[in-house]
Interface confidence: low
């Protein structure tokens, strides 16, 4: 019995269906096929869980959190024992193992390993201003999404015709900050932060209005 090499890892957006591949070759009839799918969750590597089991011609549920969401992709018994997981959750991220036995066929590699990463698009980021908006001050524009896997990067743009930030601005796309030094009237306007990762983008807008000092009445 020989389990085929798996592609290594599967990535899927949260809420979508993941298909975890596992196939094997055997010299024996599939009369005594036994398949166990296990997961080592990323969130708790010390606590392996059973996902689904096929034994004695019957399917059995694994851990409670997989109930109603998991099944074999094809009719069992078969040499393709791939499974699907519906409505994927963040907690489904982990290393999945399929363990295959088909007596009397012994020997060979009987384990396949596939990583599953559940991706989450950036949630709507928060745009904020730190610092005084008085003429000549330094301000920091902040942008941050609560959620996002992989971790989002942040791109700030000034929504004028050029999409360029003012010349006195420095941007940190990892932290989501823009520092604008010595703000002037030209710094005023609408700024957009675009939070993005491999599977999505989300934006927020911020209106920066530089306050000019009022002329003092004599």
């Amino acid at each position: 019995l020989e389990v085929s090499e798996s592609p290594g890892s599967v990535q899927v957006a949260r809420g979508q269906t993941a298909v975890l591949p596992c196939a094997f070759s055997t010299s024996a009839a599939l009369l005594n096929l036994n398949v166990i799918w296990m997961v080592i969750p990323l969130s708790n590597a010390n606590q392996p869980e059973q996902v689904i089991l096929y034994q004695g011609g019957q399917m059995f549920d694994g851990a409670l959190r997989f109930h109603g969401r998991v099944g074999f992709t094809g009719t069992m018994p078969a040499t393709n024992v791939s499974i699907f997981i519906n409505n994927t959750q963040l907690s489904d991220t982990g290393t999945y193992q399929c363990l295959v036995n088909n007596l009397p066929d012994r020997g060979g590699r009987n384990i396949g390993v596939t990583g599953l990463t559940v991706l989450v698009p950036p949630s709507a980021p928060q745009c904020q201003i730190q610092g005084s908006q008085d003429l000549g001050s330094d301000v920091i524009l902040l942008c941050s999404s609560e959620e996002g896997i992989p971790r989002p990067t942040y791109l700030w743009e000034k929504l004028d015709n050029t999409l360029k930030l003012p010349p006195t601005a420095t941007q940190d796309q990892v932290q989501g900050t823009v520092t604008i030094r010595n703000i002037s009237a030209l710094s005023s306007g609408l700024y957009q932060c675009v939070a993005s990762n491999a599977i999505g983008t989300s934006t927020c807008l911020l209106d920066l209005q530089v306050i000019s000092p009022q002329p003092r009445s004599v």
Partner: antibody, heavy 121, light 108 residues
Framework: QVQLVESGGGVVQPGRSLRLSCAAS????????MHWVRQAPGKGLEWVAV????????YYADSVKGRFTISRDNSKNTLYLQMNSLRAEDTAVYYC??????????????WGQGTLVTVSS | ETTLTQSPGTLSLSPGERATLSCRAS???????LAWYQQKPGQAPRLLIY???SRATGIPDRFSGSGSGTDFTLTISRLEPEDFAVYYC?????????FGQGTKVEIK
Amino acid sequence: QVQLVESGGGVVQPGRSLRLSCAASGFTFSSYAMHWVRQAPGKGLEWVAVISYDGSNKYYADSVKGRFTISRDNSKNTLYLQMNSLRAEDTAVYYCARASPSQWLVLGHYWGQGTLVTVSS
Amino acid sequence: ETTLTQSPGTLSLSPGERATLSCRASQSVSSSYLAWYQQKPGQAPRLLIYGASSRATGIPDRFSGSGSGTDFTLTISRLEPEDFAVYYCQQYGSSPWTFGQGTKVEIK
């Protein structure tokens, strides 16, 4: 004077592709963001996509995301819309429009005359 | 996505009358980033108003825009024969930019 001339429209079968062009003249093309907007026969306007002055930023309507690609060649003063996996609901007159000088989100005064795309088997 | 609802669908008026067109947004339009366009049959749209109340270059002063947040209005103080057309509002405060379904101003 400012001129925008669309071309590339026609009749195409569902699932096929088409590329629209918009030739610009009378202004410094490389300084302006550009939009595509469409209008189904007898219907209202629907914004399709926008591209920044240098092509580094692009945004799409959800209805075309993943199927349409906006691009530009500033050396040729030309805006493009590559439309793949066309559907019957993509049937419309497609307009290119120049952003206003002060706000790249405002479509501005200048629009092409439109080119008709008909998706039909 | 911000949905814009225009009312009425059709406005039947005579030349010289005042036209009031309404545009209501499903959520607040950031910084009054709202535009109005005019479209005549067989023609491309023409920008009238941007920023809710700023008239575009060359637009007669009988066209005015007002409003903020979710409620916006286009007013044509005295209708001229060339003003009979379809009018669209559009928000550009958040992506995707969206248009209203249009109001047709027709001759009574």
